[in-house]
């Protein structure tokens, strides 16, 4: 049957008594029992006495009386009585406990740390107890954080418990520092101090500060340095494991660097003298801090003697492209110890030849690759102390994307005009590595008469590849290729001869090699108008006759054709538009705008100009005709000048009669 819990003579969960009084506490139970007492009471051999006796009806119960003479404030705590031996089926120990406050007005706190603060270890996010328990439950305690904060209990995150102190349910960085519990009793202020110390188990980083893998000659000394970086309040254990550990071959030195204001750096340096073949293998540095663990390892290789092997990484002939930001020329090298590296270009030290050449390990880096970087590159490897030398040569070809010479030197802002029926020679000169091939294409203009400009890709008509026998577009006399030396370079010149210029369009030459393709568009506009712009006067009229002027412009080069009359008013030349483009006649190659003034009078004399806008430059062009209506006194020829709108105008023929301007 289940034993009844032991019974204490003082009832309830807590009891308050005054310091200096004697505590009498009896425990009565159905079996032998023992006392569990506050730590300071257990140490009291003089004041404390426990007497055991048989009690109860027929003396069948077990009694134990605890007497504590002149009880002190620091005897405050839990007093419990529990059965000594409980049947194994009973998992829970049967006990009764009471918390006894031993009140002392001169000592409100059970433990006082008024001079040197007590260190409390804390972990962020975990419960933190500031153990300023009191000798009476009625004492009001305030928790302060240096310098000015008061941590006020809110019943939830911060709870006050007179038996434990302040319980902070999830401590934060705000609780790190000097915390003080304060109590005022009878007008007297008492303080007990605690210093919270956040001990972390964070390992920020672990490194072995030696190259990986480690290579050594037999008989040399191995030194491995393991570095662990942690936050300031972390301590670590560092251990090594290595191949010949059983023979304790290594000596290990440890040190800590606390000069950094943000972190601790722990060092563990492993040293093995006179390395042998048995010492080769994996060396591991293990770092532990509480539950945190990190490790790092490195392989150690032992060599009997110095050696160099060198091979081509890919093939012996390498290719790159001019204009590349950087090109790495590298060889596959295995060597020990590290050899000295020199690169030669065409037999001369490369890095001395150009600042664009840099040595990185067993590689040569060429910055901003140019054509001149092509050549033979040799790597020289030497371990002088061991008299070991090796070299290997690779050939670098620098390919160059094609360039068309005429594209670079062309200074024509407008497309050229080709007279109708003329023979024309078109040339494209290209350079590249490898030598580019040049092909010619024809892109016809859309022969819609309203179309004023022919652009490449301006319509859906495709481009046609050309050869000497092509019947696309204009008749071709020949297409020839020849080598030409221009600016000291071998260039490929391709010439296309147009036998009979009849159809407007675009000739395209395309130069290509394995690196890329470049094209040049040659606008081939046929004109049946001299210079692409022509003004014609049928005859200079006499008074009463009709004035007939015509203006013909190349339709691919000009638009917005208008006749204007220039008049001077108050020393300013005014332009009066006297016709519209709508009246123009569009033909295969040109646009003609006729101007007819019927039954002219002397007042119709003046400067007549045909104005058109250059399709490509947007510039307005004027072609002027001085018209003098012949009366009795003036029979001069008209003076014809082709000028831009920006040039000044002059009147070359005046009549002797009154002409209105």
């Amino acid at each position: 049957s289940k034993l009844k819990d032991p019974e204490l003579s003082l009832k309830g969960t807590q009891h308050i008594m005054q310091a200096g009084q004697t505590l009498h506490l009896q425990c009565r139970g159905e079996a032998a029992h023992k006392w569990s007492l506050p730590e300071m009471v257990s140490k009291e051999s003089e004041r404390l006495s426990i007497t055991k006796s048989a009690c109860g009806r027929n003396g069948k119960q077990f009694c134990s009386t605890l007497t504590l003479n002149t009880a002190q404030a620091n005897h405050t705590g839990f007093y419990s009585c529990k059965y000594l031996a409980v049947p194994t089926s009973k998992k829970k120990e049967t006990e009764s406990a009471i918390y006894i406050f031993i009140s002392d007005t001169g000592r409100p706190f059970v433990e006082m740390y008024s001079e040197i603060p007590e260190i409390i270890h804390m972990t962020e996010g975990r419960e933190l107890v500031i153990p300023c328990r009191v000798t009476s439950p009625n004492i009001t305690v305030t928790l302060k954080k240096f310098p000015l904060d008061t941590l006020i209990p809110d019943g939830k995150r911060i709870i006050w418990d007179s038996r434990k102190g302040f319980i902070i349910s999830n401590a934060t960085y705000k609780e790190i520092g000097l915390l003080t519990c304060e109590a005022t009793v009878n007008g007297h202020l008492y303080k007990t101090n605690y210093l919270t110390h956040r001990q972390t188990n964070t390992i920020i980083d672990v490194q072995i500060s030696t190259p990986r893998p480690v290579k050594l000659l037999r008989g040399h000394t191995l030194v491995l340095n393991c570095t662990a970086t942690t936050p300031l309040n972390t301590r670590v254990q560092m251990t090594w494991s290595y191949p010949d550990e059983k023979n304790k071959r290594a000596s290990v030195r440890r040190r800590i660097d606390q000069s950094n204001s943000h972190a601790n750096i722990f060092y563990s340096v492993l040293t093995i003298d006179k390395m042998q073949n048995k010492d080769k293998g994996l060396y591991t540095c293990r770092v532990r801090s509480g539950p945190s663990f990190k490790s790092v390892n490195t392989s150690v290789h032992i060599y009997d003697k110095a050696f160099i092997t060198v091979k081509h990484r890919k093939q012996q002939v390498l290719e790159t492209v001019a204009g590349k930001r950087s090109y790495r020329l590298s060889m596959k090298v295995k060597a020990f110890p590290s050899p000295e590296v020199v690169w030669l270009k065409d037999g001369l030290p490369a890095t001395e030849k150009s600042a664009r050449y840099l040595t990185r390990g067993y590689s040569l880096i060429i910055k901003d690759v140019t054509e001149e970087d092509a050549g033979n590159y040799t790597i020289l490897l030497s371990i002088k102390q061991s008299n070991v030398f090796k070299n290997l040569t690779a050939t670098l070809i620098v390919n160059v994307k094609p360039q068309i010479y005429e594209k670079a030197v062309s200074s024509f802002p407008d497309p050229a005009l080709y007279p109708l029926g003329s023979r024309q020679i078109l040339t494209c000169t290209a350079y590249g590595i490898p030598q580019p091939t040049i092909k010619w294409f024809w892109h016809p203009c859309n022969h819609n008469h309203s179309e004023a400009r022919c652009d490449f890709c301006s319509n859906n008509e495709e481009s046609f590849i050309l050869d000497a026998d092509s019947n696309m577009g204009n008749r071709i006399e020949s297409i020839t290729q020849r080598m030409a030396i221009i600016e000291g370079k071998n260039k490929m010149a391709s010439t296309l001869v147009v036998a009979d210029s009849r159809i407007s369009g675009i000739y395209i030459c395309i130069a290509s090699n394995k690196v890329g393709t470049v094209g040049r568009n040659i606008s081939f506009y046929i004109t049946d108008v001299p210079n692409g712009f022509h003004v014609n006067l049928e005859k200079m009229p006499t008074e009463g006759e009709d004035l007939k002027l015509s203006c013909t412009v190349n339709k691919f080069l000009y638009r917005d054709v208008t006749w204007i009359l220039l008049r001077t008013v108050n020393n300013r030349t005014m332009h009066y538009s006297i016709s519209k483009q709508k009246m123009a006649i569009t033909k295969e190659h040109s646009i003609t705008l006729n101007l007819t003034i019927m039954n002219v009078s002397l007042q119709d004399s003046g400067t007549y100009a045909c104005r058109a806008r250059n399709v490509y430059t947007g510039e307005e062009i004027l072609q002027k005709k001085e018209i003098t209506i012949r009366g009795e006194h003036c029979n001069k020829k008209a003076v014809f000048s082709r000028i831009s709108k920006f040039k000044s105008t002059r009147n070359d023929c005046t009549t002797q009669s009154n002409v209105k301007h």
């Epitope: 008061t150 209990p153 809110d154 006050w160 418990d161």
Partner: antibody, heavy 121, light 112 residues
Framework: QVQLQQPGAELVKPGASVKLFCKAS????????IYWMRQRPGKGLEWIGE????????TFNEKFKTKATLTVDKSSSTAYMQLSSLTSEDSAVYYC??????????????WGQGTSVTVSS | DIVMTQAAFSNPVTLGTSASISCRSS???????????LYWYLQKPGQSPQLLIY???NLASGVPDRFSSSGSGTDFTLRISRVEAEDVGVYYC?????????FGEGTKLEIK
């Protein structure tokens, strides 16, 4: 003994602001939170927010975040609550209260008499 | 926000008999630390509210032991074992498990 003094009434115009005070005495002002509560006529209580007088830290009910500003003057042991952009909806009795959270042994809180704020033109 | 629900009026009680007032929360007020964050306040006519019960079952300082409280995580009852004339007023339940603190609308204790 612990006391929280509040003025009896304030009459303010719509759109204006009012600054209510709560003068504490009989205890160490910085050792306890000050809470502010609102009670509209015939209605229940609403918690506006709290201030820790030792460092001025405040926590608000989202509903009052733009309405109320809590401050303290440690030298005079006085807590203040400023209410801005007042409307007739803000007419209520405003209480300051000092709770003391002692979880196992005793717990006592103290309330001011409340300030009746009337918003009227 | 946690919603606290109360009846507006209690059943009228005779002086000297016991009375019960109920309150329900929209969420359990039991914290992982074992404390239930429920409070009972009494507001007597023309006075400021006063605390009766804190953390569900603890009697506030100076409150007569005629008052007691019990409940689960969401349903709570305030009991007055022998009602006296001075117990008349509006009883509010409140929670501070989560911000903001929220109060019930109050239950008026009526005497027969």
């Amino acid at each position: 003994q612990v006391q929280l003094q509040q003025p009896g009434a304030e009459l303010v115009k719509p759109g204006a602001s009012v600054k209510l005070f709560c003068k504490a005495s009989g205890y160490t002002f910085t050792n306890y939170y000050i809470y502010w509560m609102r009670q509209r006529p015939g209605k229940g209580l609403e918690w506006i927010g709290e201030i820790n007088p030792s460092n001025g830290d405040t926590t608000f009910n989202e509903k009052f975040k733009t309405k109320a500003t809590l401050t303290v003057d440690k030298s005079s042991s006085t807590a203040y609550m400023q209410l801005s952009s007042l409307t007739s909806e803000d007419s209520a009795v405003y209480y300051c209260t000092r709770p003391s959270f002692y979880s196992y042994d005793y717990y006592k809180d103290y309330w001011g008499q409340g300030t009746s704020v009337t918003v009227s033109s | 926000d946690i919603v606290m629900t109360q009846a507006a009026f209690s059943n009228p009680v005779t002086l000297g008999t016991s009375a019960s007032i109920s309150c329900r929360s929209s969420k359990s007020l039991l914290h992982s630390n074992g404390i239930t964050y429920l409070y009972w306040y009494l507001q007597k006519p023309g006075q400021s509210p006063q605390l009766l019960i804190y953390q569900m079952s603890n009697l506030a300082s100076g409150v007569p032991d005629r008052f007691s409280s019990s409940g689960s995580g969401t349903d709570f009852t305030l009991r007055i074992s022998r009602v006296e004339a001075e117990d008349v007023g509006v009883y509010y339940c409140a929670q501070n498990l989560e911000l903001p603190w929220t109060f019930g609308e109050g239950t008026k204790l009526e005497i027969k």
